[in-house]
């Protein structure tokens, strides 16, 4: 029961996280005009990964897309790439995890397959979350660097010094959405990986049996480990039990303690 809850919660948390990563990637407010210690301007500037916007006090908002690839800073391209990779991995992870959910029955899918799918989706969520966190952090670092470089410049105009206001940018809402979303996706991924351990079918505990063959005596222990070192020619009855494998004479599946729906 706990495994199903952990898996379900991991899925929901990851789903919220990936929705947040998508939202953050699409948001225009990655960087917003710093209003602290600034002359009061009637124009508010903010920028996203795909376009920059200006909101005027009149209520009019104008957004312009970055209609160039080569002209954009490499860091911005890197952030875009990280966010997109995060979304793609997260989306694939969600797709995989849906089929891996314990509460969903698909044909005669075995627990081992569900466990593997849960682990795969968990890893995908972790990488997706890390991509988002990395992308947002790279952008934040870029902002901090630019902030201190963007001090007010002085231009010499006709009749003396004329000050121009250099727009400085600070952290926008999208950064916080991205950090939280990335964190949630990461947590969801970890939960899926934890759930995977509980989903993996337990090894059947076979009692140690001594086979008294005409040749060397070989004792067999569970887990496929041969206790004896005697290698004789008579090996027809030497059966090694593997935790996940099933032999012909074990076609019926044994319920594990986690097989409650």
């Amino acid at each position: 029961m706990a495994v199903t809850a952990c898996q379900g919660l991991g899925f929901v948390v990851s789903l919220i996280g990936i929705a947040g990563i998508i939202a953050a990637t699409c948001m225009d407010q990655w960087s917003t005009q710093d209003l602290y210690n600034n002359p009061v301007t009637a124009v508010f500037n903010y920028q996203g990964l795909w376009r920059s916007c200006v909101r005027e006090s009149s209520g009019f908002t104008e957004c312009r897309g970055y209609f160039t690839l080569l002209g954009l800073p490499a860091m911005l391209q890197a952030v875009r790439a990280l966010m997109i990779v995060g979304i793609v991995l997260g989306a694939i992870g969600l797709l995989v995890s849906i089929f891996a959910l314990k509460c969903i029955r698909i044909g005669s899918m075995e627990d081992s397959a569900k466990a593997n799918m849960t682990l795969t989706s968990g890893i995908m969520f972790i990488v997706s979350g890390l991509c988002a966190i990395a992308g947002v952090s790279v952008f934040a670092n870029m902002l901090v660097t630019n902030f201190w470089m963007s001090t007010a410049n002085m231009y010499t105009g006709m009749g003396g010094m004329v000050q121009t206001v250099q727009t400085r940018y600070t952290f926008g809402a999208a950064l916080f959405v991205g950090w939280v979303a990335g964190g949630l996706t990461l947590i969801g991924g970890v939960m899926m990986c934890i759930a995977c351990r509980g989903l993996a079918p337990e090894e059947t505990n076979y009692k140690a049996v001594s086979y008294h063959a005409s040749g060397h005596s070989v004792a067999y222990k569970p887990g496929g480990f041969k206790a004896s070192t005697g290698f004789g020619s008579n090996t027809k009855n030497k059966k090694i039990y593997d935790g996940g494998a099933r032999t012909e004479d074990e076609v019926q599946s044994y319920p594990s303690k986690h097989d409650y729906v």
């Epitope: 009061v40 124009v43 200006v54 009019f60 206001v165």
Partner: antibody, heavy 118, light 113 residues
Framework: EVQLVESGGGLVKPGGSLRLSCAAS????????MSWVRQAPGKGLESVST????????YYPDSVRGRFTISRDIAKNSLYLQMNSLRAEDTAVYYC???????????WGQGTLVTVSS | DIVMTQSPDSLAVSLGERATINCKSS????????????LTWYQQKPGQPPKLLIY???TRESGVPDRFSGSGSGTDFTLTISSLQAEDVAVYYC?????????FGQGTKLEIK
């Protein structure tokens, strides 16, 4: 069609108060920035207060700050200018104007005259 | 507050001739976010409210004749009437729309010579 009609002007004694109203129609009132602009007889234009679109922040020049208050009633589609501690130099035609692109003022009312005199 | 200075205070131009009015601001009105200059030009005739001519320093308002044009960037701006018509006699004002409070120039009175 955008329409702005000012009212509330008149004669008032120095130190007195007056409340100007501007009835707006033909647009979504809360979405646009609005301004009160005055013009003293034979003089130039002076912006006395601005309320921004959406967030409704208010701004005043030093000449009226602390004495004038701009506000709006979205339900009534009305803009107001509360003028206290009036002085002789506040005598002017007061225009209500709606802003748009570039914070410019494409729409103006016909104005209302405020006379401050003893 | 931002100081807007217009020159000349008055201008007399012959019909069909070019009229040029200048406006200078004490601070740059250029917004780096969209590379637009927040300067507006108005025309006011006696007994009427002002009429918007140009916004963003060079964008003509719809319905304004194309003989009116605006130019300039940063702190120096110009309104040009390419061929003066009788109906263009008025007072012209520039306005800072970038910094609060929005301030107007003192006005330039345009007359026919």
């Amino acid at each position: 069609e955008v329409q702005l009609v000012e009212s509330g002007g008149g004669l008032v004694k120095p130190g007195g108060s007056l409340r100007l109203s501007c009835a707006a129609s033909g647009f979504t009132f809360s979405s646009y920035g609005m301004s009160w602009v005055r013009q003293a007889p034979g003089k130039g234009l002076e912006s006395v207060s601005t309320i921004s679109g959406g967030d409704s922040y208010t701004y005043y020049p030093d000449s009226v700050r602390g004495r004038f208050t701009i506000s709006r009633d979205i339900a009534k589609n009305s803009l107001y200018l509360q003028m206290n501690s009036l002085r002789a130099e506040d005598t002017a035609v007061y225009y209500c104007a709606r802003s748009y692109n570039g914070n410019s003022l494409p729409y103006w009312g016909q104005g209302t005259l405020v006379t401050v005199s003893s | 507050d931002i100081v807007m200075t217009q020159s000349p205070d008055s201008l007399a131009v012959s019909l069909g001739e070019r009229a040029t009015i200048n406006c200078k601001s004490s601070q740059s009105l250029l917004n780096s976010g969209n590379q637009r200059n927040y300067l507006t030009w108005y025309q006011q005739k006696p007994g009427q409210p002002p009429k918007l001519l140009i916004y963003w320093a060079s964008t003509r308002e719809s319905g304004v004749p194309d003989r009116f044009s605006g130019s300039g960037s940063g702190t120096d701006f110009t309104l040009t009437i390419s061929s003066l018509q009788a109906e263009d006699v008025a007072v012209y004002y520039c306005q800072n729309n970038y910094f609060y409070p929005f301030t107007f120039g003192q006005g330039t009175k345009l007359e026919i010579k």
